[in-house]
């Protein structure tokens, strides 16, 4: 058993049929010595008396809010949560496996630049009685500070018969140099509590590996005289690290119709303009990627050909 | 400690071309190592990230773009002194700081070159003959060093009398290649910045 936060405790249980469970001793936070009784949740049934209560925790029915009272007055609470371990593996029932970039990916993180700011998100099908708490650091043995905000519900989607909820959190490394060469990864730890179930999820990454620039901005077209060709120009996204001559991007320019199966014109360039062949009912799209360290491409920025 | 936006001569950047070749060569070599050594811990997640130039050179700090010198987190650098005559430099107009930066890059390359050559000598003794360093990568390091053209004491190639542990050597190769790729990215950024300045 360990303390998650004040008056909230996590009991770690090996979860298999007829498991013995864990013996837990609760102590009432009071100077009083006698006349103390214990109850669980809203029940008025007295579970025991005395300053300490010893319980055998085996299943979710044994978890919950234990309260010690004296003469009708509440003295203190202890909330017990369960953390299940099945076949030596901690349960991951609360969050959905996003399977990208690999299986058992519950947390996904992205950074728009090298400033040390990043966003992580996760998915669940659970809609109520759910809380998250996020901590982060650079490195684990001698951790350096990363400050994370509160996790918020950022999107709701319908997937077949199920509703899916996306939560996200923004974090900022306390003293980040955009030009630094990372040798210690960022660690992100998410505590998830659903009713009386506790789970924790972690992710470890270098900012350089989770870079995904915003799409290029201000796409403009200029038809070339006596030609089917069009000059398309754009600018670096505002959120990208500066100076741009140091933090350079490379671009992919594509002309394509509405269907991905349609024919296309595609060209890669380090410049902020390119010449392509425009077709009726097609769109010109441009996306960006760090020129020197191949992490993710940005989403496409598009303009119609006509 | 930073690169001022001085205007280099047009002839400044044979180094840009060489640095692009360097990044390409080390990336290819790393990819080859990851494929060949698939049953060794050779991915970014599996290895320890070590920097053999730590406390010996200060390339990131010495080559910091002017715009980032206002960022205090970028300025916790160590004092290091370097030689200052290089052919990538924009003749006499080049600032002292730029010379420091380029000579720091030169020192990095020299250290990695020695490590890679020592390691290759060991890998050549491996009866499995599983992996060797790409000669192209070694040649590209040499070309960039020549383009930088700093005079500096030659570092003797480390020789070892004991029987090499090939497993450890291959893991060290992965660690070195990952670190060198990151440094090659920095070098490419610096050369691009200088070229644009």
């Amino acid at each position: 058993i360990w303390e998650l936060k004040k008056d909230v405790y996590v009991v770690e249980l090996d979860w298999y049929p007829d498991a013995p469970g864990e013996m837990v001793v609760l102590t009432c936070d009071t100077p009083e010595e006698d006349g103390i009784t214990w109850t669980l949740d809203q029940s008025s049934e007295v579970l025991g008396s005395g300053k300490t209560l010893t319980i055998q925790v085996k299943e979710f029915g044994d978890a919950g809010q234990y309260t010690c009272h004296k003469g009708g007055e509440v003295l203190s609470h202890s909330l017990l949560l369960l953390h299940k371990k099945e076949d030596g593996i901690w349960s991951t029932d609360i969050l959905k496996d996003q399977k990208e970039p690999k299986n058992k990916t519950f947390l996904r993180c992205e950074a728009k630049n090298y400033s040390g700011r990043f966003t992580c998100w996760w998915l669940t099908t659970i809609s109520t009685d759910l809380t998250f708490s996020v901590k982060s650091s650079r490195g684990s043995s001698d951790p350096q500070g990363v400050t994370c905000g509160a996790a918020t519900l950022s999107a709701e989607r319908v997937r077949g018969d199920n509703k899916e909820y996306e939560y996200s959190v923004e974090c900022q490394e306390d003293s980040a140099c955009p030009a630094a060469e990372e040798s210690l990864p960022i660690e992100v730890m998410v505590d998830a509590v659903h009713k009386l179930k506790y789970e924790n999820y972690t992710s470890s990454f270098f900012i350089r590996d989770i870079i995904k620039p915003d799409p290029p901005k201000n796409l403009q077209l200029k038809p070339l005289k006596n030609s089917r060709q069009v000059e398309v120009s754009w600018e670096y996204p505002d959120t990208w690290s500066t100076p741009h001559s140091y933090f350079s991007l490379t671009f992919c320019v594509q002309v394509q119709g509405k269907s991905k199966r349609e024919k296309k014109d595609r060209v890669f360039t380090d410049k902020t303009s390119a010449t392509v062949i425009c077709r009726k009912n097609a769109s010109i799209s441009v996306r960006a990627q760090d020129r020197y360290y191949s992490s993710s491409w940005s989403e496409w920025a598009s303009v119609p050909c006509s | 400690r930073n690169l001022p936006v001085a205007t280099p001569d047009p002839g400044m950047f044979p180094c840009l071309h060489h640095s692009q070749n360097l990044l390409r060569a080390v990336s290819n070599m790393l990819q080859k190592a990851r494929q060949t050594l698939e049953f060794y811990p050779c991915t970014s997640e599996e290895i320890d990230h070590e920097d053999i130039t730590k406390d010996k050179t200060s390339t990131v700090e010495a080559c910091l773009p002017l715009e980032l010198t206002k960022n205090e987190s970028c300025l916790n650098s160590r004092e290091t002194s370097f030689i200052t005559n290089g052919s990538c430099l924009a003749s006499r107009k080049t600032s002292f700081m730029m010379a420091l930066c380029l000579s720091s890059i030169y020192e990095d390359l020299k250290m990695y070159q020695v490590e890679f050559k020592t390691m290759n000598a060991k890998l050549l003794m491996d009866p499995k003959r599983q992996i060797f360093l790409d000669q192209n990568m070694l040649a590209v390091i040499d070309e960039l060093m020549q383009a930088l053209n700093f005079n500096s004491e030659t570092v003797p190639q480390k020789s070892s009398l004991e029987e090499p542990d090939f497993y450890k050597t291959k893991i060290k190769l992965c660690i070195l290649l990952h670190a060198f790729r990151i440094r090659a990215v920095t070098i490419d950024r610096v050369m691009s910045y200088l070229n644009a300045s």
Epitope: K263, D265, R266, V267, T269, D270, K280 | -
Partner: antibody, heavy 118, light 107 residues
């Protein structure tokens, strides 16, 4: 299986024209760009131009501009390349090529040898 | 027009040995570079597109690298069927242009 089948070899006199055909099978004809590339005996490859069969748009290499015409007939899934004012240096194997991507070729025809000789 | 220069023009190689062909562009072309193989009496066949992207059906011993002006086609271990002429082609701008070709011959 996508195939491009070209017309047979031709012998032409200098100053005349030649029209080479390229019939596509497998896949929808208008879903691909069609190009023409030539190769003089013992020489390298030379791009001549492309057509978008969907709308008839064409683009020619400046070297051949005014002398080459690329057309396409959607009803027969056939593309044509006509080269006029032939000279001896036009002796070459002419390939039609196609792709959904405009700027390179994933399938080429078997080639048509055009010999220009007096 | 962008001029593509291949080297060497002739490459004698022992079967089983690796081979590398270089292609240089007269100006920067990013990764807009494609490689073809041509055997005598046959049409060219696409091997690699956009500098390093492999084509399904092409053996994995063929790989491409490079960006900007310098590109390399590598055959990790030459098989008898790989003796042919190899061409690079730029698609950065029209007109599309090819290298002169590199003939890989049996040593």
């Amino acid at each position: 299986q996508v195939q491009l089948v070209q017309s047979g070899a031709e012998v032409k006199k200098p100053g005349s024209s030649v029209k080479v055909s390229c019939k596509a099978s497998g896949g929808t004809f208008s879903d691909y760009y069609l190009h023409w590339v030539r190769q003089a005996p013992g020489q390298g490859l030379e791009w001549m131009g492309w057509i978008d069969p969907e709308n008839g748009d064409t683009e020619y290499a400046p070297k051949f501009q005014g002398r080459v015409t690329i057309t396409a007939d959607e009803s027969t899934s056939t593309a044509y390349m006509e080269l006029s004012s032939l000279r001896s240096e036009d002796t070459a194997v002419y390939y039609c090529a196609r792709n959904k991507e405009l700027r390179y070729f994933d399938v080429l025809g078997q080639g048509t040898l055009v010999t220009v000789s007096s | 027009d962008i001029v593509m220069t291949q080297s060497p023009l002739s490459l004698p190689v022992t079967p089983g040995e690796p081979a590398s062909i270089s292609c240089r562009a007269s100006q920067s072309i990013s990764i807009n570079l494609h490689w073809y193989q041509q055997k005598p009496g046959q049409a060219p066949r696409l091997l690699i597109y956009f500098a390093s992207q492999s084509i399904s059906g092409v053996p994995s011993r063929f790989s491409g690298s490079g960006s900007g002006t310098d590109f390399t086609l590598t055959i990790s271990s030459l098989q008898p069927e790989d003796f042919a002429t190899y061409y690079c082609q730029q698609s950065n701008s029209f007109p599309l242009t090819f290298g002169q070709g590199t003939k890989v011959e049996i040593k």
